[in-house]
């Protein structure tokens, strides 16, 4: 009997009520592997969740968060409010980044501006709530006697907020 069931492809189940015939998964269910005795019910993307990928007979639905929110956790298991760039989400809602910190995304926390002097560089472009500082050549490189043939160091890419 197991051999008969192993022939049932994804999208079907091995129907014990019909002599191990491979029956299609009923509506709103799926089987992602062959040889299944039952089909799994599809996930519903309702409430704060919206459908990113419809359920098919061979794969489950995938959910996303409704507009203004972003997914947290495996399989988008929770939705968290978006904030604007230059803000972070606190228990009291979205708050502007404090001076000296920035957030270039709609999620995550405000992070300190890069300290250019730690790399022996100077600030080329000041930081804002939405953007990190851009570090340029070291102050010594900008002195009158310094050669101008060497191109300045490339601007540091702002990092990504923790997900």
């Amino acid at each position: 009997l197991q051999d008969l069931c192993s022939n049932c492809p994804a999208g079907t189940f091995c129907d014990n009520n019909r002599s191990q015939i491979c029956s299609p998964c009923p509506p709103n269910s799926f089987s992602s592997a062959g040889g299944q005795r039952t089909c799994d019910i599809c996930r519903q993307c309702k409430g704060v969740f919206k459908t990113r990928k419809e359920c098919s007979s061979t794969s489950n639905a995938e959910c996303d968060c409704i507009s203004g929110y972003h997914c947290l956790g495996a399989e988008c298991s929770m939705c968290e409010q978006d904030c604007k760039q230059g803000q972070e989400l606190t228990k009291k809602g979205c708050k502007d980044c404090c001076f000296g910190t920035f957030n270039d995304q709609k999620r995550g926390i405000c992070r300190p501006w890069t300290n250019c002097s730690l790399d022996g560089k100077s600030v080329l472009v000041n930081g804002t709530k939405e953007r990190d500082v851009v570090c340029g050549p070291s102050p010594a490189d900008l002195s009158p006697g310094a050669s101008s043939a060497t191109p300045p160091a490339p601007a540091r890419e702002p990092g990504h907020s923790p997900q």
């Epitope: 019910i41 996930r43 929770m78 409010q81 228990k91 809602g93």
Partner: antibody, heavy 115, light 107 residues
Framework: QVQLQQWGAGLLKPSETLSLTCAVY????????WSWIRQPPGKGLEWIGE???????DSNPSLKGRVTFSVDTSKNQFSLKLNSVTAADTAVYYC?????????WGQGTLVTVSS | EIVMTQSPATLSVSPGERATLSCRAS??????LAWYQQKPGQAPRLLIY???TRATGIPARFSGSGSGTEFTLTISSLQSEDFAVYYC?????????FGGGTKVEIK
């Protein structure tokens, strides 16, 4: 800190209408789904239903259309009405924020239905 | 609807010991499961979502695992404040449903 504060009549007679309101303080109101959950004395939790600020709702089929939700975005409040109550509706009723799971809850209101 | 079954109904554990609570779904719910803690006279508090992700401010001694139909909440070393009732809840499908709860009591 998001806080949910709820109130409503605590003692009802059979066939009357249960009416509860929940106010949301701190944090955003619009965009979230807001739910009602109940817990009969000494028993487990039962989801009643949910509403979003736009007025869209969903409810538990077990309540057979006895339930009505409403929302007042100007006050950051949402409400529950359950008509034709019986003793089986005696429970602590909670409001909660729905973000997938229920991440913030009201303090609960005991509603007793007795003749 | 998806039926959630918790076991045992009551778990007697000594402080400092490990507690393991089980939750079973009547159908596969992937990892779309939450755990809550409820103390007498209080509202439930979210502990875990997505079967294994701790909610904000929840101590590391709480951990969740499982996928499909079998789930576990583990409290690695019980503190006095952990004696309470614990509920699992699926939000994979509507209506949203809870398990019957497991009471963790002092041995």
């Amino acid at each position: 800190q998001v806080q949910l504060q709820q109130w409503g009549a605590g003692l009802l007679k059979p066939s009357e209408t249960l009416s509860l309101t929940c106010a949301v303080y701190g944090g955003s109101f619009s965009g979230y789904y807001w739910s009602w959950i109940r817990q009969p004395p000494g028993k487990g939790l039962e989801w009643i239903g949910e509403i979003i600020h736009s007025g869209s709702t969903d409810s538990n089929p077990s309540l057979k259309g006895r339930v009505t939700f409403s929302v007042d975005t100007s006050k950051n409040q949402f409400s529950l009405k359950l008509n034709s109550v019986t003793a089986a509706d005696t429970a602590v009723y909670y409001c909660a924020r729905l973000t997938g799971p229920f991440d913030y809850w009201g303090q609960g209101t005991l509603v007793t239905v007795s003749s | 609807e998806i039926v959630m079954t918790q076991s045992p109904a009551t778990l007697s554990v000594s402080p400092g010991e490990r507690a393991t609570l089980s939750c079973r779904a009547s159908q596969s719910i992937s990892s779309i499961l939450a755990w809550y803690q409820q103390k007498p006279g209080q509202a439930p508090r979210l502990l875990i979502y997505g079967a294994s992700t701790r909610a904000t401010g929840i101590p590391a001694r709480f951990s969740g695992s499982g996928s499909g139909t079998e789930f576990t909440l583990t409290i690695s070393s019980l503190q006095s404040e952990d004696f309470a009732v614990y509920y699992c809840q699926q939000y994979y499908n509507w209506p949203l449903t809870f398990g019957g709860g497991t009471k963790v009591e002092i041995k």
